[in-house]
């Protein structure tokens, strides 16, 4: 309907349009995480704050044990910032005693789970070499992207180290999407 | 009106639609920033360009005096990237001292001030600890993220220090946001 | 048509709507890079993977040659991540052999070619210098802004140095675009 | 220090117009958003409406909108209330009021009597 | 408009007692704000987004509640508390007040 104007005649075509306002969107926030169990070889999962502070869902877009569920399919934004703190990075201490310097890293890892795969399918990583000279050293890695989703997808955050994830405030550690 | 052709028929339920192309838009760009005062114990907020090069505000978003103005409520998308350059930073020279290493940081905060709480409101925050080998440094720090705003809400940028903040290209440093 | 009821009124002004489904879209992945000739004194540009895993274009969103063909004018929210990675950056060699330490560094730059303009345009661009300590490294350059674009522009993503760029993963390294 | 110090004619006409001005001091006007509260005598606290000077945006009491006007002059870092057709119900002591960075801060108050 | 009913209206408490005043908002608000007003003063902000201590607060004031209910504490009544107590709600158009409630030294 580009440059066209919408008019109400009965031989106007109609595509399925939608009040943006009810879109599935959601924004979660960081909470102190509890260990929990993860698969062999799959990085842990964050879990997360939906509805105090900053943190919402809504229209049909909920969240449940560490995943956001996809009501609706379509092209969604997917975002997640997840900031890392800890003390000096091994490789230094690995370094200064001589051995092989390999770098301890930090990644972050927007993970899809879907009925229609059997495998979780990653579909944003950030990852990071860290190799501080600071004995105490702190960094986001931020991700975003558009992905083609369907209803029932699961999303997660998984991360390297949840030890190592900032939980203070809200407004460094989060994770969001909402369908375009 | 998911999946539902929307023609003019009387027994249509109408949600309330809108073109895209007038929700309020906006992207600012750096300029060279001047001294200005802050609340002790906040950043100081950097102020932009909003009319040459690449920055533009539209359908009644405004900027002024370093603030974004949201005309309306609604979901938007926040996002800014601040480009922070220096020379080596103290924490080296520190270490060489041979005293405590605590690292240099820089730091942005997207802000929200709204006139139903009396609080500035941080919306998101990038902040990595700088500890630099080398003399001169740079790199930058992206946010972006989606909030519930009001309509009165504005929005403005801080930085841990102005005079880190490269403004020098329209394409380092910047802020913007739209309406969902 | 804020917060007013869009019924088949034949008083009621339409403005131009469309679907949110047929707007332009793409999202591009990674792939190994071929060696190509580039303008002097202009980053050379990644090419893409654009249909296969979790590339796709749509609605008349090309991608052809390194560029992503904008086929409506409008308001695009352009991305990029670059993952960069290499081994022990010279900046740290030189500094152990006493010479200036002048650092290395890593730059992604999202760049318009306009015909209306004979001069490529720099939207976005993340540069960070790299000085590091260990052996191996690795980061991501993330990139995210709104931009007015016009039909018949092109899109493209320069980084300053091709072999430094991460194409092992498709959601390590990517670059998309959308009409908002 | 932050100030806001509000002044103005403490004695109005019935059926004419209530002008009171806030000046401040010790912030930017710009950074808040300015409130006018009232208190009549024996009374609660009753919000009268704010204007955000960055922009000049306002929202009032519906209760007192046909006749509230607050406006802002951020080059003399003052807000000025206006009031129309008053009644002896007027008669109050008039605050301005700073919100959006803590701490919320209040005028001392400027008592306005209206009588003929 | 969103009402807020406080109450008591006035109370009279022994110094070193727990005093309590509630706040009832007519529908659900996000925040609740707590003033005091000594006579012919103005008033000054205790507590925000209902239970951050506002800056320079003695520790012994308090807030708490969500929803439509709220309710404001002093641990521990001092002859310095002797004043006016009002609730307030700014989320809703217009920002209304409770009618507030006076606090006495028996």
């Known amino acids: 309907l580009k440059g066209q104007e919408f008019a109400p005649s009965h031989q106007q075509v109609y595509a399925p349009l939608r009040a943006d306002g009810d879109k599935p969107r959601a924004h979660l926030t960081v909470v102190r995480q509890t260990p929990t169990q993860h698969f062999k070889n799959q990085f842990p999962a964050l879990h997360w704050e939906h509805e105090l502070g900053l943190a919402f869902t809504k229209n049909r877009m909920n969240y449940t044990n560490k995943f956001l569920l996809i009501p609706e399919s379509g092209d969604y934004f997917i975002y997640s910032q997840v900031t890392f703190r800890g003390m000096t990075s091994e490789c230094s201490e690995i370094r200064q005693a001589g051995r092989p310097n390999k770098p301890d890293s930090i990644t972050v890892v927007i993970t899809k789970v879907t009925d229609s795969y059997p495998e979780p399918t990653q579909l944003l990583m950030g990852t990071k070499s860290v190799c501080e000279v600071g004995s105490n050293w702190f960094q986001p890695i931020y991700l975003g992207a558009m992905f083609s989703l369907q209803e029932g997808d699961k999303l997660m955050v998984n991360v390297s180290d949840i030890s190592l994830v900032d939980y203070t405030k809200e407004d460094k550690t989060f994770f969001g999407a909402f369908l375009l | 009106l998911k999946g539902q052709e929307f023609a003019p028929s009387h027994q249509q339920v109408y949600a309330p639609l809108r073109a895209d192309g007038d929700k309020p838009r906006a992207h600012l760009t750096v300029v060279r920033q001047t001294p200005t005062q802050h609340f002790k114990n906040q950043f100081p907020a950097l102020h932009w360009e909003h009319e040459l090069g690449l920055a533009f505000t539209k359908n009644r978003m405004n900027y002024t005096n370093k603030f974004l103005l949201i005309p309306e409520s609604g979901d938007y998308f926040i996002y800014s990237q601040v480009t922070f350059r220096g020379m080596t930073s103290e924490c080296s020279e520190i270490r060489q001292a041979g005293r405590p290493n605590k690292p240099d940081s820089i730091t942005v905060v997207i802000t929200k001030v709204t006139d139903s709480y009396p609080e500035p409101t941080q919306l998101l925050m990038g902040t990595k600890s700088v500890c630099e080998v080398g003399s001169n440094w740079f790199q930058p720090i992206y946010l972006g993220a989606m909030f519930s705003l009001q309509e009165g809400d504005k929005l403005m940028v801080n930085v841990s220090d102005i005079s880190l903040v490269d403004y020098t290209k329209e394409d380092k440093t910047f802020f913007g946001a739209f309406l969902l | 048509l804020k917060g007013q009821e869009f019924a088949p009124s034949h008083q009621q002004v339409y403005a131009p709507l469309r679907a949110d489904g047929d707007k332009p879209r793409a999202h591009l992945t990674v792939v190994r890079q071929t060696p190509t000739q580039h303008f002097k004194n202009q980053f050379p540009a990644l090419h893409w993977e654009h249909e296969l895993g979790l590339a796709f274009t749509k609605n008349r969103m090309n991608y052809t040659n390194k560029f992503l063909l904008i086929p409506e004018s409008g308001d695009y929210f352009i991305y990029s991540q670059v993952t960069f990675r290499g081994m022990t950056s010279e900046c740290s060699e030189i500094r152990q052999a006493g010479r200036p330490n002048k650092p290395d560094s890593i730059t992604v730059v999202i760049t318009k070619v306009t015909d209306s303009y004979p001069e490529p345009t720099q939207l976005l661009m993340g540069t960070k210098s790299v000085c590091e300590v260990g052996s191996n490294w690795f980061q991501p350059i993330y990139l995210g802004a709104m931009f007015s674009l016009q039909e018949g522009d092109k899109l493209m993503v320069n980084v300053s140095d091709i072999s430094l760029v991460d194409y092992t993963k498709e959601d390590k390294t990517f670059f998309g675009a959308f009409l908002l | 220090q932050v100030q806001l110090q509000e002044s103005g004619p403490g004695l109005v006409r019935p059926s004419q117009t209530l002008s009171l001005t806030c000046t401040v001091s010790?912030?930017?006007?710009?950074?808040?958003?300015m409130h006018w509260v009232r208190q009549r005598p024996g009374r609660g606290l009753e919000w009268m409406g704010r204007?955000?000077?960055?922009?000049?945006?306002?929202k009032y009491n519906p209760s007192l909108k046909s006749r509230v006007t607050i406006t802002r002059d951020t080059s003399k870092n003052q807000v000025s209330l206006r009031l129309s057709s008053v009644t002896a119900a007027d008669t109050a002591v008039y605050y301005c009021?700073?919100?959006?960075?803590?701490?919320?801060?209040w005028g001392q108050g400027s008592l306005v009597t209206v009588s003929s | 408009d969103i009402q807020m009913t406080q109450s008591p209206s006035s109370l009279s408490a022994s110094v070193g007692d727990r005093v309590t005043i509630t706040c009832r908002a007519s529908?659900?608000?996000?925040?609740m704000y707590w003033y005091q007003q000594k006579p012919g003063k103005a008033p000054k902000l205790l507590i925000y987004?209902?239970?951050n201590l506002a800056s320079g607060v003695p520790s012994r004031f308090s807030g708490s509640g969500s929803g439509t209910d709220f309710t404001f504490t002093i641990s521990s009544l001092q002859p310095e508390d002797i004043a006016t107590y009002y609730c307030?709600?700014?989320?809703?158009?217009?920002?209304?007040f409770g009618q507030g409630t006076k606090v006495e030294i028996k």
């Open positions: 204007i955000d000077p960055a922009g000049g945006h306002t």
């Open positions: 307030q709600q700014w989320e809703g158009n217009p920002r209304t």
């Open positions: 010790g912030f930017d006007m710009q950074d808040t958003y």
């Open positions: 529908q659900g608000v996000e925040y």
């Open positions: 009021v700073r919100s959006g960075g803590l701490p919320d801060e």
């Open positions: 987004g209902a239970s």
